[in-house]
Every structure is written in C-alpha cells, then in structure tokens.
C-alpha cells in the first residue's frame, strides 16, 4: 500500500473511531435494565455517563442529569475522565494529522516535518483509542460486579420468599454505548497504528531508485537500496547513508547532498 493511501486510510479510520468515541460518551445507554425476569416491562431504565433515563411503555421518556460531582462513584468519574481524555487527544490528533497529510501542501513544509507530525498524530490516536477502550472496560467491569451483587441480593434478600410481597431489584446490563465505545476505541487505535506505519515511509527519500556511491577514482563500490528502511524521521539523519570501502565516514559524508552523479 502506498504511503499516501496508508496515511489517508489511517486518518479516515481514526476519524470514524473518534466520532464513535464522542457518540459513545454522549450516549445515554451505557447500562440498560436487564429484562431477563420481565421481558415485557412497562417501565425501562437506562443510564449514561451524564444522566439516567426512564422510558415508559407510553412512549414518555424522562431523563435526569447527575447534578453532582462529589456524590458520584469514583469509578464513574474515572470513566468520564478517560473518555474525555480520549476525545481531547483525538481532537489534537486530528488537527495534527490534517497538517501531516501528504496530499495536503501547506507552505514549504518538508517531508521530514510531515513524517514527525504523522507519527505524533498516530501516537495521539493510539493513546486516545486505548483511553476509550480502558474507560469502557472499567464501566463494563463495574456493571458485571454490580450485576452479580444484585443477583445475589435478589436470591438472598427476600426472606426466603416467605412473605407475599416481592421486592424486585433492578439489574443493569451492557448498553449499546459500551459496544460503540469498544469498536470506536479499536478503530482509533488501528488508525493510529496505520499513521505510525505511514510515517516510516514518509521519511524523506530523494528517490526510490537504488543509490550508488563513488570514490574519487570512479571505482564502483557496494550499494544498498534506499527507500523505506527504518526511516522514522527522528534521531539521526538516515538519508541513504553511503557505504565506503575504507576509511571512516566524515560528518560531511553523512550530511552531504547527492549530486547528479550519485545515482545510476
């Protein structure tokens, strides 16, 4: 796959994933009422990160925001934080990657700068995706724990069902937002990885032809292909290092610009 295609696809995949992370964060259905005991309930409860809702069979839906910070479970606060971190990093990643796209020319930005920006955006997308996946997973774990705790209460806390009155405890199970979040986080992560892969190919190469170096005598010596080998754009300059038969490379050798005689 060409560098431009890899970079472009990575950007699009990350963008879709990022949109999914925002959607999941805003969705109300992080946890939904478990209908195992009563599949035809006239009242259906579901909860999000920001509010809880009740949908009546009549079609009326009432939602109430969590108008408190201190009264909320620490885990819920942590999940909120992780999702927001994912969104913020995603926004920065998108802004950086727009400037890094090979198909977009901005001023006299060289390929080296684009490579660095591509890698940066890739890393941001990876962290954004991981942050969302961790957030969703923490919430899912919290749900599973609460589900089994309330199940235990249902079967132990009824006084052996001796009384006539049953107290039905509402249990919650995975809502649609969890699946959206997992998929979105995964897409953002994959997109980020693709951006990082594209970065390797973006490291400036003056040509994709095979480079050949010459001694002053004109004797042809060993050569190695140029192109995409481990070019990250960070650290030392990796521009088609020349290999000489003898003698140490000078600083000039490493930094020298090719002449029209450098290539066959």
């Amino acid at each position: 796959m060409s560098v431009t295609a890899c970079q472009g696809l990575g950007f699009v995949v990350s963008l879709i994933g990022f949109a999914g992370i925002i959607a999941a964060t805003c969705m109300d259905q992080w946890s939904t009422q478990d209908l195992y005991n009563n599949p035809v309930t006239a009242v259906f409860n579901y909860q999000g990160l920001w509010r809880s809702c009740v949908r009546e069979s009549s079609g009326f839906t009432e939602c109430r925001g969590y108008f408190t910070l201190l009264g909320l479970p620490a885990m819920l606060q942590a999940v909120r934080a992780l999702m927001i971190v994912g969104i913020v990093l995603g926004v920065i990643g998108i802004l950086v990657s727009i400037f890094a796209l090979k198909c977009i020319r901005i001023g006299s930005m060289d390929d080296s700068a684009k490579a660095k920006m591509t890698l940066t955006s890739g890393i941001l997308f990876i962290i954004s995706g991981i942050s969302a996946i961790i957030g969703v997973s923490v919430f899912a774990n919290m749900l599973v724990t609460n589900f089994w705790m309330s199940t235990a209460n249902m079967y132990s806390g009824m006084g052996g069902m001796g009384g006539m009155v049953q107290t039905v405890q509402t249990r919650y199970t995975f809502g649609a937002a969890l699946f959206v979040g997992w998929v979105a986080g995964g897409l953002t992560l994959i997109g980020g990885v693709m951006m990082c892969i594209a970065c390797r190919g973006l490291t400036p190469d003056d040509s994709n032809f095979k480079a050949v170096s010459y001694h002053a005598s004109g004797q042809n010596v060993a050569y190695r292909p140029g192109g995409f080998k481990a070019s990250t754009g960070f650290g030392s300059n990796t521009r088609n290092k020349k290999i000489y038969d003898g003698g140490a490379r000078t600083e000039d050798d490493e930094q020298s610009h090719p002449t029209k005689y450098d290539y066959v």
């Epitope: 409860n45 069979s57 009549s58 509402t170």
Partner: antibody
Framework: EVQLVESGGGLVKPGGSLKLSCAAS????????IHWVRQAPEKGLEWVAY????????YYADTVKGRFTISRDNAKNTLFLQMTSLRSEDTAIYYC???????????WGQGTTLTVSS | DIVLTQSPSSLTVTAGEKVTMSCKSS????????????LTWYQQKVGQPPKLLIY???IRECGVPDRFTGSGSGTDFILTISSVQAEDLAVYYC?????????FGAGTKLELK
C-alpha cells in the same frame, strides 16, 4: 376535545369472529399507544391488548393470546381488534383507551358490547 | 403477574365524611430509575367508562378535585377522599402500571348511607 368511539360489537356464537374498531380524534393519534380493556357484566376491569404508536410493540393478555389481534391505521386514526375463536367468557364491554405519561389511561371510549352466546 | 388486592370491597359513608381505601400489590411498583411508584387510580360511575384520578401513586390528574389524594409506599397504597360528596359515589380501581400484563384491583364500591 379528545374522543374515542368504539364500534363493531354485537352478538356472536361461540367459536365465531368479530372485528372491533375505535375511531380517535382530538389528538395526534400516531403519537400514542392505545389499549383495549374489557369489563365483563358486573365484574371488574381486565386489560386485553396494547399497541404502540408505530405498531412496533404489541402485547396481549394471556387469556386472549393467539385468538385476538390488535392493529392500527394511523392514516385513518383507527384502532382495531380482530377477535376469533370467541368464547362465552369474552362477553364484555370493550373499551379502547389512550395510553399517556405515567403509564395511565387518560382517555377512554364509551365502550362497545360483545355478547358471545349460542 | 402482579396481583392487586383492594380493600374494603365496599364502603358505606355519609356525605362530608373522610374515606380511605387500600390497594396492596404483590410486588413493589416503585421504579428505582426515577423513584416513581407506578400505581394508578380510576373512578367508574355506573354506566360510564372509567375516569383517571391519580397516576404515579400521588399525582392528581388535571381537573380532579383536590379532595382526592393518593399516597403509599412501593407495595401499599391508599386513596383518600377528604370529604365525600354525592358525585363521588362510584367504584374505585387501582391499576399496576409497572409491568405487563397490566392488572387492576377488584375495586372498592363507595355507597351513600
């Protein structure tokens, strides 16, 4: 003014069929779920069936499941109850009722009487 | 299915008297999501369809006189008429609005002495 008018009741032999209708006016019919509730002579109220605003959700009482079919035509603001395999215990006044916030029947029709007798 | 037990089955009172009738549920009608109790009260006069009085156990429907008051926990509910009038003579039904099948109590018949 909200109005629900039932029609189609009458005398039917056991095992027979009949279709009840409920014409609605005075509110946006397509926005509300509607129920059928019946009342046997000198008895209490018994819920029969429910259909949601867009017909996506339908529930029946166990006593009528498989024999009765609830449907609606939002274009004509009309609710239907198709009854088959009728029994003497189905004899009752059949009301259609509008379902509203709080899961309550805020408006009822005047009812139509079904008598199942040989 | 949720069973609603109404008591007494009939009640004979004099005008101006305070009346209370009970409705007990076999299952809690309290929804944890919004802390609302899904019990509804209806009044049915002879030869008429039922009329909505109270929903969510204590919310009076528009146009219902304030002498009618609903209260109760998740399983035990009470309808109170603070001062009975002649036009209040009817059968009063409670209804489970929490889960299907929707169920009604057998009714409490209010009669004048």
């Amino acid at each position: 003014e909200v109005q629900l008018v039932e029609s189609g009741g009458g005398l039917v032999k056991p095992g027979g069929s009949l279709k009840l209708s409920c014409a609605a006016s005075g509110f946006t019919f397509s926005d509300y779920g509607i129920h059928w509730v019946r009342q046997a002579p000198e008895k209490g109220l018994e819920w029969v069936a429910y259909i949601s605003s867009g017909s996506s959700t339908i529930y029946y009482a166990d006593t009528v499941k498989g024999r009765f079919t609830i449907s609606r035509d939002n274009a004509k603001n009309t609710l239907f109850l198709q009854m088959t395999s009728l029994r003497s215990e189905d004899t009752a006044i059949y009301y259609c009722a509008k379902w509203d916030r709080g899961n309550c029947f805020d408006y009822w029709g005047q009812g139509t009487t079904l008598t199942v007798s040989s | 299915d949720i069973v609603l037990t109404q008591s007494p089955s009939s009640l004979t009172v004099t005008a101006g008297e305070k009346v209370t009738m009970s409705c007990k549920s076999s299952q809690s009608l309290l929804n944890s999501g919004n802390q609302k109790k899904y019990l509804t009260w209806y009044q049915q006069k002879v030869g008429q369809p039922p009329k909505l009085l109270i929903y969510w156990a204590s919310i009076r429907e528009c146009g219902v006189p304030d002498r009618f008051t609903g209260s109760g926990s998740g399983t035990d509910f009470i309808l109170t008429i603070s001062s009975v009038q002649a036009e209040d003579l009817a059968v009063y039904y409670c209804q489970n609005a929490y889960s299907y099948p929707l169920t009604f109590g057998a009714g409490t018949k209010l009669e004048l002495k």
